[in-house]
């Protein structure tokens, strides 16, 4: 049917656009941007996610945020919206837009997202200098239905608040040196 054919061609166009971007082909980013702009659907939103990741990798954070906001407008799928909003909040924290990040996180509903939202909320609050708020967010996250790894990480962040947190970089270096 026409519907099946158009879905198949949209899927193929999406695959082509995203594969070209991930392989770093010349002119692939403008082509993917065009695809995302023209496809106001799940494929467009997924293309925006991939593009945003490329922009983050190139440290073009403003572009990444704009692309993610475009992706949000393109889909009605709640889970996909949650993933996009999480990425957006991370980028906003990096852009020192903590209040915007907190607003973004407030839009993510559903028990399944509670722990990862709590982790990011803590990071956003800490970036504003609100240590007590960060502690409360992480404590709530630890109590939620959370994977052991994420729970442990948030507990470590709580502990670090009281001992003058070593930088995330140093934590990562320590981890890698013992791998």
């Amino acid at each position: 049917s026409h519907q099946v054919d158009s879905a198949r061609s949209a899927s193929l166009a999406y695959q082509n656009a995203v594969t070209a971007v991930s392989e770093g082909k010349p002119d692939s980013i403008p082509a993917a941007e065009k695809f995302a702009a023209e496809n106001k659907n799940t494929y467009g939103a997924l293309a925006s996610l991939e593009l945003a990741q490329q922009f983050v990798d190139k440290n073009e954070l403003e572009k990444a945020a704009a692309q993610l906001q475009q992706g949000l407008a393109d889909t009605s799928d709640e889970n996909l919206k949650a993933v996009i909003n999480l990425r957006l909040a991370r980028v906003q924290v990096q852009l020192k837009q903590a209040d915007a990040a907190l607003k973004t996180l407030d839009t993510i509903k559903g028990e399944g997202w509670a722990a990862i939202v709590a982790d990011l909320r803590g990071e956003a609050l800490l970036s504003k200098g609100d240590k007590q708020g960060a502690r409360s967010a992480w404590e709530a996250g630890v109590k939620s239905d959370v994977t052991p790894a994420l729970s442990e990480m948030m507990q470590m962040k709580i502990n670090n608040l009281s001992i003058g947190s070593p930088s995330r970089l140093e934590e990562e270096l320590r981890r890698r040196l013992t791998e």
Epitope: V56, N59, E123, E170, E172
Partner: nanobody, 122 residues
């Protein structure tokens, strides 16, 4: 985009010393100074592992197996990192890679040099 150029590998006898150096380009001093700089190594048939690093705060950190034998130093003003390797052992034989680690909040980003061969053999 950070580019890394190593120098100083070679062949050395067990118990000997070597010094590796690495200079970064394509990045401002202030941007690089917010990143960690250090060294990884990859022995034949093994995974690449971090050996030593200097954080953005200037703290030197080491893998346990090289502690006391290797010294990592970082020159923040000249975008350089060096690895002084003393009392070398045959198991230190590997390709050594200069490495920069950037914290991008939602992920860590790695930059690598081309690698320089260190062979410890009598």
């Amino acid at each position: 985009e950070v580019q890394l150029q190593e120098s100083g590998g070679g062949l050395v006898q067990p118990g000997g010393s070597l010094r590796l150096s690495c200079t970064a380009s394509g990045v401002t001093i202030s941007a690089l100074n917010a990143m960690a700089m250090g060294w990884y190594r990859q022995a034949p048939g093994e995974e690449r592992v971090m050996v030593a690093a200097v954080s953005s705060r200037g703290n030197a950190m080491y893998r346990e197996s090289v502690q006391g034998r290797f010294t990592v130093t970082r020159d923040f003003t000249n975008k350089m990192v060096s690895l002084q390797m003393d009392n070398l052992k045959p198991e230190d034989t590997a390709v050594y890679y200069c490495h920069v680690l950037e914290d991008r909040v939602d992920s860590f980003h790695d930059y690598w040099g081309q690698g320089t061969q260190v062979t410890v053999s009598s």
